[in-house]
């Protein structure tokens, strides 16, 4: 295991999101992954940590107490309203995309550091293994946690949701590409407001950085609203342009990022390597997927999600 | 995941007091807002009271010196103290949690004011 936990460091350092064989695939517990795991396509909570205290709209309509309000928030990356290219919110709908590390590339040497295709392939092989492993041991944990202890009825604990719930919610929920990094879940609700009763809200946020990814998750109580929020594509939300699609559902054991579709292969320049959000964004995948040169120009590819 | 969990609504008499109590689980925010709303079948929700993690409240005309949100933070719970109800208080009324990222919604309870 030692070796394999060296090649897969190696991996990271080579990059190891290589395309083909060399390409991560996700397990996905249940229909979408536990709080924090980073894990868009299911109905669990996606692990934002920061918060920010703002009037929420339907306020402005109420007679609020005199008393100042410490104005808490936290910095985050504004995104110009009419700033050119896709911007943000290019995580695919359902999909188990990883977390957007800000700075650097895992490992990236610089300029110039092209190692051997095929080590790159069986290192990211390795590693990809691992990781299966590791979240097929984090699932069964799980499970007999969840079979050694359920709560005696009538004790509020927390809802676990069955796959078939899980699918069910995502039935009813959108998926908000392209939002505005400064955007609250408030705004959003109160963009959605017509469509129909909302049940919750999520701006996915960085696991590491805390800052929004651009893309957000609606549920709402029924499907008919989902319909009706479709007339929203591409309507304007803090002077962006958004993409609303249905939300898809992770199912358990499926690759969320193998999906079949054709790949686009261009060449992007990118020289800011110390921005969270320097890389280059293409569609609805954050990430560079392929393989990534480590010259000047990195070759890579993506996925429509439809 | 937030769970919201209202509970306290029944029949009372005008002129009579109801407590609504509503209980948020999971991984909540320390700062974030809880708040009452209401619903009559055919209408939107309408915004009751609402309170902010640092104390700070706000209600609705109509409610305004009858209703009293109450909100404590340790123990992730909002409460409404519904006095002097009258008749056109009857709705399903729903907790709210909202933060920066996230906003949750309970599934309501049943407030029926009626003689």
């Known amino acids: 295991m030692a070796a394999a936990a060296a090649a897969a460091a190696a991996a990271g350092a080579a990059g190891g999101r290589g395309s083909g064989p060399g390409r991560r695939r996700h397990l996905v517990p249940g229909a979408g992954g536990e709080a924090g795991e980073g894990a868009p396509g299911g109905a669990g909570d996606y692990g934002n940590g920061l918060e920010s205290e703002e009037l929420e709209p339907e306020e402005l309509l109420l007679e609020p107490e005199p008393e100042p309000e410490p104005e808490e928030e936290p910095p985050r990356p504004r995104a110009p309203p009419g700033a050119p290219g896709p911007g943000p919110g290019s995580g695919a709908p359902g999909s188990q995309e990883e977390e957007e590390e800000p700075g650097l590339v895992e490992g990236d040497p610089g300029d110039g550091a092209i190692e051997d295709p095929e080590l790159e392939a069986i290192k990211a092989r390795v590693r990809e293994m691992e990781e299966e492993a590791e979240k097929l041991k984090e699932l069964q944990n799980e499970v007999e946690k969840q079979m050694n202890m359920s709560p005696p009825p009538g004790n509020a604990g927390p809802v676990i949701m069955s796959i078939e719930e899980k699918m069910e919610a995502d039935a009813r929920s959108i998926y908000v590409g392209n939002v505005d990094y400064g955007a609250t879940a408030e705004e959003l609700e109160a963009h959605f407001h017509g469509c129909g009763s909302v049940n919750r809200v999520t701006i996915l946020c960085d696991k590491f950085s805390g800052h929004p990814k651009g893309f957000a998750y609606i549920e709402f109580s029924d499907k008919e609203s989902v319909r009706t929020s479709l007339a929203l594509d591409e309507s304007l939300f803090r002077g962006r342009q958004i993409k609303v699609i249905p939300k898809r559902t992770n199912r358990p054991g499926i690759s969320t990022t193998d999906r079949g579709f054709p790949r686009a292969r261009y060449r992007a320049r990118t020289t800011n390597y110390n921005s969270s959000r320097s890389r280059f964004y293409s569609g609805f995948n954050s990430r560079p997927r392929g393989r990534v040169y480590r010259g000047r120009a990195r070759a890579t590819s993506w996925y429509s999600p439809y | 995941e937030v769970q919201l969990v209202e509970s306290g609504g029944g029949l009372v008499q005008p002129g009579g007091s109801l407590r609504l109590s509503c209980v948020a689980s999971?991984?909540?925010?320390?700062?974030?807002?809880m708040a009452w709303f209401r619903q009559v079948p055919g209408n939107e929700r309408e915004l009751v009271a609402t309170m902010s993690s640092s104390g700070i409240t706000s209600y609705a005309g109509s409610v305004k010196g009858r209703f009293t949100i109450s909100r404590d933070n340790a123990k992730n719970t909002v409460d409404l103290q519904m006095n002097s109800l009258k008749p056109e208080d009857t709705a399903v009324y729903y907790c709210?949690?909202?933060?920066?990222?996230?906003?949750?919604w309970g599934q309501g309870t049943q407030v029926t004011v009626s003689s």
């Open positions: 709210k949690y909202s933060s920066r990222w996230n906003i949750y």
């Open positions: 999971g991984r909540t925010s320390r700062i974030s807002r």
